[in-house]
Structures are given as C-alpha cells and as structure tokens.
C-alpha cells in the first residue's frame, strides 16, 4: 500500500529570479512506500521497463531510450507478385453444366488442358508462375482466370512486372488470334474466339521502402531516407556512416535531434573544434607557471 | 476414372477390311468425347475418327468413306470398321476419351488411353 506522505514546500529562487518550489518531507512520519512504475519514468519515448532494462520502441535505443539509432531495419519482401485477372473463349470445348462444379471430372480434365495450354504460350516469360481458373460459363467455354507473375524483389520490380505483364497481354493475344477452328475442328490442343480475349484487371504487389522508413523513424521521418547497397533498401540517418547521404563530423560525434543530425564536437588536449561539421580546430594557448 | 482396353488389330490384305472395338470401365461412356487415334512407325500420332456426345464427328480426310466411328451405350464399347484397307493404313491404333465435349484433333487434349492394337495391311 502506498502511504500519505504529508508534505511541506520550501521557495527558493534561481539566478534567474524565477521561484522555485521544492517538496520538502516531514520526517518524524514513518513511511512504507512501494516503488510502483519507477523505472518507467526511466523509459523515454513510450519506452517500458522490462524489469532489467528499457525496451525502447524504434527509432530509439539505449539505457533510457533517449537516443536515436543510425539505421532502421526495413525488410522487403524477398519476392513480388502480379495478379492478371483475364477472359479467353474456349471454342474446341462445348459448355456442360458440370464444368461449374470445380470438383468434377469435367472440370479437372478442363483445368488440366487449359493449364498446359496456357503454360506452353507463357513458357518465355521468367516471372511467369501459372494460371488458376475462377470460373467457367457458357459460350462455348469462356475462362475467367488469374495468371500469376512473381520476381525477386529490387528497385525496379515494378518496371519488371510491368513489362511481365505486357508480355503476357502480347502472348494471349497471338495465341487467341492463330488457334482458332476451321471447319468445327481444332487442331491445337485448344482453339479460342480471338474477340473474347479480355484482360479484367492488373494487380501488382505494392512495397515502398521509402514509405516503411518514414513510418518507422516516426517523427524523425523528415530526416531518415533508403540508400540502396547490392539492390538492398537500407533506412538510414545521415549519423549512419558509409552512405552517399552520410555526413561528416571530422572531429565530433553525430547525433540525431529533432531539428535533424546535428554534429556534437570533441576538445582534445590540443584543440577545441568547432564549426558545424567540427572541422574548425582552434589551438589552445599554453600558460606557463612560474614559482 | 475411365479405363480403357482396345481389340481387334491383326494382319489383313489390302482390300481388306477389320472391326476394332474399345471397351471402357467407368461411368461416363454417355458423355463426353471418344476417337480413335493411330501411330505409324516414325511418325506422330493422329486423329482417325473422333465423336462426341452432343452429335459432332470427325474423320480424317484419307479414312473419310471407308472408316465408320460408333458406339454402343448399352455395352459401353466404340468401334472402328475399317473397309477397303491400305498399306498405308499400318500403324497402332488407340482409342481414346475425355469427359469433354471435344472438338480437337490434338492427341495431347484426351486424357484418357487404352493401350494400342496393331493393324498390318499387307499382301
């Protein structure tokens, strides 16, 4: 239980002239005080106490969670898709009503043809993964399906799937335009109506670096930013050195503040440094003492 | 699952004439597509006659008039009457189906095979 503690204040005033006031306790009172949360006020900026140390919260590190680190971890994710929502007319196959049943026969045998059809007019494209049919209707047999791309991720996979799916776009539609019947009679493993060719929808897998590295560094977000090394994002502060964006502190040590890096400078022996990148070296004079 | 067990292949004169028969296990002989196919040594395998469950027939233009695709519900059998045989008529011949209603010639688009019968034409 925490206990009253009755309390006297005493004034003071600074050099300043401003009044201070501080507790003063009464002491001929015995107290018994459990410490509740004190170590939390230890924990700055939404840091927590995990009962050995402060569990600092990023941008933020060190024993009270009152620095800021150089870099922020962000992962890309290893690969990137794109989803091509398409529809092809299917004309060497007529419509029954059990290819609406994906668990059929009908259906099997349908989605089996249709996946090595469509795997032979896509077997150039590198990002190319497969296709999946999401439904069937009549007329002769129209194909709503996905064809899906993925690549390893780097800066460009956007450009990367974009092209991907042209490719695609280019494909189907020479595929559709050559295999068609003649005469009711399709030599192909399947034959198309060239007009019911019809890409729906293109979805591409969205990941912004740029985006996660603001997120992340908070309210420090303005002066974080990704410097790209062998393809990979890295999220720094320009306190991280070895990038194009770090800067140079000479004789100092950088240090994030919320007006951005600031460059805190050494005193030697010899010199006092100064200057914004602590590059300024002013020498100190020598006394000599006589007895 | 539709099995298939192809018969009747055997060595004829030119002129000649043969009636080869494929019986099919399973449920699904009054649907679909079935054909019969060949293979000559060295050469790819092709569609000889082919019929479908909603009327459509096909038949290659060098059988067309003396080849006859049919089917027997009832005992779940195609049969291939080959007439005025050729020499060039020789190869393996299988028959074929797919729960589809197929209008391809296209081997790689029937899933399912009986195993072959060999047809010589020879004097």
């Known amino acids: 239980p925490l206990a009253t503690i009755p309390v006297s204040t005493t004034s003071l005033t600074s050099s300043e002239g401003s009044t201070i006031s501080t507790p003063s306790v009464d002491i001929s009172t015995p107290v018994t005080t459990s410490i509740v949360g004190d170590q939390c006020s230890r924990c700055k900026n939404g840091g927590f106490w995990d009962g050995l140390k402060c569990q600092c919260l990023t941008p933020y590190y060190g024993e009270s969670c009152e620095e800021v680190v150089n870099s922020i971890d962000i992962a890309p994710p290893e690969t990137v898709s794109a989803q091509m929502e398409l529809t092809v007319t299917v004309t060497s196959v007529k419509f029954t009503d059990e290819l609406k049943n994906h668990s059929s026969q009908e259906f099997r045998e349908f989605n089996k043809t249709f996946t090595e059809q469509m795997n032979i007019v896509y077997s150039g494209i590198p990002e190319y993964v497969g296709v999946n049919i999401t439904n069937l209707r009549l007329g002769s047999v129209v194909v709503e399906h996905d064809v899906l791309l993925r690549t390893k991720y780097t800066p460009e996979y956007k450009t990367a799937l974009d092209n991907a799916t042209e490719v695609v776009k280019q494909k189907i539609t020479k595929v559709t335009t050559e295999q068609i019947m003649t005469n009711d009679n399709c030599s192909a493993l399947m034959c198309f109506n060239t007009t019911g060719t019809q890409v729906q929808n293109i979805t591409v897998t969205q990941y912004d670096p740029v985006e996660e590295c603001r997120q992340k560094a908070e309210e420090y977000e303005d002066y974080f930013l990704v410097e790209y090394r062998d393809q990979k994002p890295y999220c720094i502060s320009p306190c991280e050195s070895g990038f194009n964006a770090s800067k140079n502190c000479n004789h100092g040590k950088c240090q994030m503040s919320q007006n951005g890096a600031r460059c805190l400078c050494v005193t030697t022996e010899t010199h006092w440094y100064s200057g914004e990148d602590c590059n300024q070296g002013t020498q100190k004079s020598h006394h000599h003492h006589h007895h | 699952e539709v099995q298939l067990q192809a018969s009747g292949g055997g060595v004829v004169q030119p002129g000649g004439s043969l009636r080869l028969s494929c019986a099919a296990s399973g449920d699904t002989f009054s649907r679909g597509s079935w054909g019969w196919f060949r293979q000559a040594p060295g050469k790819e395998r092709e569609a000889v006659a082919l019929?479908?469950?909603?009327?459509?027939?096909f038949y290659a233009d060098s059988v067309k008039g003396r080849f006859t695709i049919s089917q027997d519900n009832s005992k779940n059998t195609l049969y291939l009457q080959m007439n005025s045989l050729r020499a060039e008529d020789t190869a393996v011949y299988y028959c074929?189906?797919?729960?589809?209603?197929?209008?391809?010639?296209?081997?790689?688009?029937?899933?399912?095979w009986g195993q072959g019968t060999m047809v010589t034409v020879s004097s």
């Open positions: 074929a189906a797919s729960v589809l209603v197929l209008r391809t010639l296209n081997p790689k688009a029937w899933h399912h």
């Open positions: 019929i479908s469950s909603d009327g459509w027939t």
